[in-house]
Structures are given as structure tokens and as C-alpha cells.
């Protein structure tokens, strides 16, 4: 397509940047504003800086969950992440257990034995 | 707060979220999806374990996760918005949010790395 | 086992600069940081920095002052500008195989270089 000789013509075209880029972050900056928007009220507005701020939060979250769920498969000598690696890494720490109250589908249960049931050495339950 | 195990409302914003369905009248109806972070849970992954794989019900388990902080998130900024009369959301109100919904330890180190994203996008502008 | 050796404490007059060292041996740890326990007071966290993906994460009392690096002989250095008296204290370098700053913050599962003196007058 031809475009007209503009004052710009000369200068080379500057690549475009992605919010997401411009924050320094994976997570979808554009993506995530117009999702805010979708979720407040007709007359509500949504800054710039309120989506940035989300999906930075979506991403460290992410980036925790993720950490010790690998750390979980590594433990396990096994070089994929599955729902037992994510139900492990989650049940394990109080501070993503209180967050997470939903159950992971495929997680199985979390290895406790109740310390009343532990017997003492040499002391055998008779039949 | 519990997450809610309910269908998500529909996302009006959202055109990939969103499918047709045929209704009996011809008309056609928007049923709702949840929006999909894949791509972006995996490409936080391969930061944190560049050697490490995911299976797609692990995947898939991060994705309901993300959605369902976002809900959390975006809810609890929009109350407060609301009950603050203010008309625009800013990164202020998620700050609050967050703060509000993440635990301890959890609720500092993301208010640390929200407000770290917003200097350097605004530095950068 | 984790070995960690700290260095490049001393005395520094109030306004000036310091960088602290901590190489880290042994078994792989995922990130690195430094507390600090000034005299009669508490052990405190002062900075970690992941080391795969490099976050960073800093206490309030020195964040724009102090920056955590690392570099790919894992070792981690703390850049002390602006010092004030009360940075004064012993500095510890600490690890922890989880790469997460806020567990590193907690203190609870780290391992722990020797002491290095940080005296601000």
C-alpha cells in the first residue's frame, strides 16, 4: 500500500512495545485491563497502572506456585510438574494452603499419620 | 474466601472468551469460557525451571488458579472503588486488594512485585 | 551441606558505601540473601535474590539504598549506599534451596554463612 510522504516518512519505524514489555513482566498487561474493565461497573473506569499491578501480582503468584511445585517433582526425581507436584507444593506451605482452599483435582492426599496412632518401639498391638 | 465453583459471568471485554451457541429462536447466545494463561504460566515456568515440563491437568489447575485470583482480585477492587466512591480503579485499590486477600508474607512480597511492575512502567513510558 | 562465605564488612562514616560478598559451595541453593542483626536487636531480613530468575526482593528500611546482584559463580553481592548508623550490625548471608524470596524471608529452613561486621558511625 502506498502511504502518503509524511513528515515521518524519513525516520525508521520504532518497533511497538507491549505494556507487558514497557512493566517487565510475562503476564498479559493489555489482556488483564480489558478483563478489569469487563468486571466493574458500566460507568466504572480502569487506570493503566491498576492492570500492570494485577498482572504483576498474577505473575508472582504464579512464579511462587510454580517454584515449589517443580521443587516437589525434582524431590520426586520426575522432570514434569502434575497435580500431586502442584497439591504437594500448595498443601506444604500455610500461606498458599490458606489462599488455595480449593481441592486439586488428581492432587491426592498429603502423607500424616495421627501421632496417637504412632506406637513405641516394642510395644506390638495384640489381635 | 472460598473460591467460587460456579461458572464464571459472562466477560463482556473478552472476544476470545466467548463462543457462539445456537438458541431454538435463531438467535445466537454467548456462553462464557474461562480466559486462558497457558502460554504465560508456561513462559513464567521456564524462569523459574527452565528444565522443568507441566502436564496439561497441571496446567490446567494453574489456569482455574489465575482465574480465580483474578475474580478475587478484581471483585475485591471493585467494592472498594465502590464503597470509597471513587470512579476509576487504579493500582491503589489492588494494592488494597491484595493485601486484604493474600496472607502474611504472601500479601508483601506481591505488593513488592506489583509496585516494582508499575515504576518501571511508568518510567518507561 | 551449603557452604557460604561472607566478606567485605568494616567501618564507614554515615552517607557511605559498602558491597558485601557471599559466595556460595556445596550443594545448589536457589536463593541467596542477607540479614542483619544489629546489637541487642533481633536477626532481620535485609534483601534475596533468586537465582534462576533473578527477582529481588528488599526489607523496607533499605530499599532504594541497597541493591542485591549475583553473578554465574554463585555469588551474591549486597551494594550499600547512603549507609546510616542504624545499618549497623552483623550481616549473615543465607540461602535456601526453594527459589523464593519470601521463604528465604522467613528464616525458617536457610543455611547460614558466618557473620560479617558492618559498623556505620
Known amino acids: 500500500a502506498g502511504g502518503k510522504a509524511g513528515k515521518d516518512s524519513g525516520k525508521a519505524k520504532t518497533k511497538a512495545v507491549s505494556r507487558s514489555q514497557r512493566a517487565g513482566l510475562q503476564f498479559p498487561v493489555g489482556r488483564i485491563h480489558r478483563h478489569l474493565k469487563s468486571r466493574t461497573t458500566s460507568h466504572g473506569r480502569v487506570g493503566a497502572t491498576a492492570a500492570v499491578y494485577s498482572a504483576a501480582i498474577l505473575e508472582y503468584l504464579t512464579a511462587e506456585v510454580l517454584e515449589l511445585a517443580g521443587n516437589a517433582s525434582k524431590d520426586l526425581k520426575v522432570k514434569r510438574i502434575t497435580p500431586r507436584h502442584l497439591q504437594l507444593a500448595i498443601r506444604g506451605d500455610e500461606e498458599l494452603d490458606s489462599l488455595i482452599k480449593a481441592t486439586i483435582a488428581g492432587g491426592g492426599v498429603i502423607p500424616h499419620i495421627h501421632k496417637s496412632l504412632i506406637g513405641k518401639k516394642g510395644q506390638q498391638k495384640t489381635v | 474466601p472460598e473460591p467460587a465453583k460456579s461458572a464464571p459471568a459472562p466477560k463482556k471485554g473478552s472476544k476470545k472468551a466467548v463462543t457462539k451457541a445456537q438458541k431454538k429462536d435463531g438467535k445466537k447466545r454467548k456462553r462464557s469460557r474461562k480466559e486462558s494463561y497457558s502460554v504465560y504460566v508456561y513462559k513464567v515456568l521456564k524462569q523459574v525451571h527452565p528444565d522443568t515440563g507441566i502436564s496439561s491437568k497441571a496446567m490446567g489447575i494453574m489456569n482455574s488458579f489465575v482465574n480465580d485470583i483474578f475474580e478475587r482480585i478484581a471483585g475485591e477492587a471493585s467494592r472498594l472503588a465502590h464503597y470509597n466512591k471513587r470512579s476509576t480503579i487504579t493500582s491503589r485499590e489492588i494494592q488494597t486488594a491484595v493485601r486484604l486477600l493474600l496472607p502474611g508474607e504472601l500479601a508483601k512480597h506481591a505488593v513488592s512485585e506489583g509496585t516494582k511492575a508499575v515504576t518501571k512502567y511508568t518510567s518507561s513510558k | 551441606q551449603v557452604q557460604l562465605q561472607a566478606s567485605g564488612g568494616g567501618l564507614v562514616q554515615a552517607g557511605g558505601s559498602l558491597r558485601l560478598s557471599c559466595a556460595a559451595s556445596g550443594r545448589t541453593v536457589a536463593t541467596l540473601g542477607w540479614f542483619r542483626q544489629a546489637p541487642g536487636k533481633e536477626r532481620e531480613f535485609v534483601a534475596g535474590i533468586t537465582w534462576t530468575a533473578g527477582r529481588t526482593y528488599y526489607a523496607d528500611s533499605v530499599k532504594g539504598r541497597f541493591t542485591i546482584s549475583r553473578d554465574n559463580k554463585r555469588t551474591t553481592y549486597l551494594q550499600m549506599n547512603s549507609l546510616k548508623p542504624e545499618d549497623t550490625g552483623v550481616y549473615y548471608c543465607?540461602?535456601?534451596?526453594?527459589?523464593?524470596?519470601?521463604?528465604?524471608?522467613?528464616?525458617?529452613?536457610?543455611?547460614w554463612g558466618q557473620g560479617t561486621l558492618v559498623t556505620v558511625s
Open positions: 543465607a540461602a535456601t534451596s526453594s527459589g523464593s524470596t519470601r521463604l528465604l524471608s522467613t528464616g525458617r529452613d536457610n543455611y
